[in-house]
């Protein structure tokens, strides 16, 4: 079995986790994708998923999680805005391809959210006090709730993650800078 590795990201409360998950374009463009949390001793739990079939460049918002699937670039963008300490945990991005088991798209992410510097609320440039500017989709997405950890297979490429402020612009002009390794053949 492939060893599941982790990447650690330490962020402050109020900041945004921005992850771009690479996938094989031809095979998985329209496949439903999901963002899951993995708690000790439990099955992975799906927190948000794209539609069926997954739509191109169409934001799906579930609470503070925003998913956008860019078919042209073969990547799923996952953002968790206004991070809270309780968001700390282990996450993964998966592709559903029923009736096969889901595939994990990259190394799992160990997210550690810590309290921001003390001071006036909202003074930190990375805090999220305003309403996030991505309009939520009204389309309902049918998300499978759990994935069996024994059957999730890992793909080789790593994700790229960075910290952004709530007003950060969606900019895919530099997507070629992302390391692109074929995920599945």
């Amino acid at each position: 079995a492939t060893k599941l590795t982790e990447e650690k990201y330490e962020l402050k409360e109020g900041q945004t986790l921005d992850v771009k998950c690479d996938y094989t374009l031809e095979k998985f463009a329209s496949s439903q994708k999901a963002w899951q949390i993995i708690r000790d001793g439990e099955m992975p739990k799906t927190l948000a998923c794209t539609e069926r079939p997954s739509k191109n460049s169409h934001p799906v918002q579930v609470g503070r999680i925003i998913l956008e699937d860019y078919h042209d670039h073969g990547l799923l963008r996952v953002r968790m805005v206004n991070l809270q300490v309780e968001d700390s945990g282990l996450y993964q991005c998966v592709i559903y391809q029923p009736p096969k088991e889901p595939h994990m798209l990259f190394d799992r992410i160990r997210l550690v959210v810590t309290k921001g510097f003390s001071g006036t609320p909202g003074s930190n440039e990375n805090s999220t006090q305003n309403v996030y500017k991505i309009p939520p989709t009204t389309t309902k997405a049918l998300c499978p709730l759990y994935t069996s950890p024994r059957t999730v297979t890992q793909a080789p490429p790593k994700s790229t993650a960075d910290v952004s402020t709530p007003d950060s612009e969606i900019n895919l002009t530099n997507v070629t800078d992302i390391i692109r390794v074929p995920v599945f053949n």
Epitope: K27, S31, Q97
Partner: antibody, heavy 120, light 107 residues
Framework: EVQLVQSGAEVKKPGESLKISCKGS????????IGWVRQMPGKGLEWMGI????????RYSPSFQGQVTISADKSISTAYLQWSSLKASDTAMYYC?????????????WGQGTMVTVSS | EIVLTQSPATLSLSPGERATLSCRAS??????LAWYQQKPGQAPRLLIY???NRATGIPARFSGSGSGTDFTLTISSLEPEDFAVYYC?????????FGGGTKVEIK
């Protein structure tokens, strides 16, 4: 154009073997599931099984497990349904169908069907 | 295996009328239910998936609803080309069984 083309009608005797085919074109054959569905004369649809040509992963309905064999040759983009010993009750129209690109359990493209007649 | 029961077996209606077809599952299939249309001498065609989503190219007069064990396919105003047999299919659990079909015929 995405299409599935099935082999022609067959007339066989009980106890004979048979292999019918379904050739896919216009898409990446190895990355889509192919299913087989039986329709007996004047009856409804029966789900027989599916195969993923990329790795030959196959799932059967218990009703057809051991009665038929589903296979695929990805080098020629063709899926097969075969019997080692036909019965009169195998007389039916057999359809192959492609699983959708985002959910292989749904059949979005269908072949024209192959009529199999088994009679002594 | 999951048994799907369709009713009525035959529906006799006139063009322009509303058709309501039912599909009941022997156990919950969540929203993993599809509807197919089959015309005489033709292969089936996917109409609805996930209980309520229209497949590509399917006219808006076709709509699906339901979840769990009870599902409905509605054709809001029958066109001449809609007279056919309609099958539901569950794809929640293997084997992905079909219902027995409902024939929509011209009255």
């Amino acid at each position: 154009e995405v299409q599935l083309v099935q082999s022609g009608a067959e007339v066989k005797k009980p106890g004979e073997s048979l292999k019918i085919s379904c050739k896919g074109s216009g898409y990446s054959f190895t990355t889509y599931w192919i299913g087989w569905v039986r329709q007996m004369p004047g009856k409804g649809l029966e789900w027989m099984g599916i195969i993923y040509p990329g790795d030959s992963d196959t799932r059967y309905s218990p009703s057809f497990q051991g009665q038929v064999t589903i296979s695929a040759d990805k080098s020629i983009s063709t899926a097969y349904l075969q019997w080692s010993s036909l019965k009169a009750s195998d007389t039916a129209m057999y359809y192959c169908a492609r699983g959708s690109p985002w959910d292989g359990r749904l059949f979005d493209i269908w072949g024209q069907g192959t009529m199999v007649t088994v009679s002594s | 295996e999951i048994v799907l029961t369709q009713s009525p077996a035959t529906l006799s209606l006139s063009p322009g009328e509303r058709a309501t077809l039912s599909c009941r599952a022997s156990q919950s299939v969540s929203s993993y239910l599809a509807w197919y249309q089959q015309k005489p001498g033709q292969a089936p065609r996917l109409l609805i998936y996930d209980a309520s989503n229209r497949a590509t190219g399917i006219p808006a007069r076709f709509s699906g609803s339901g979840s769990g064990t009870d599902f409905t396919l509605t054709i809001s105003s029958l066109e001449p080309e809609d007279f056919a047999v309609y099958y539901c299919q569950q794809f929640d659990n293997l084997p992905y069984t079909f219902g027995g079909g409902t024939k929509v015929e011209i009255k």
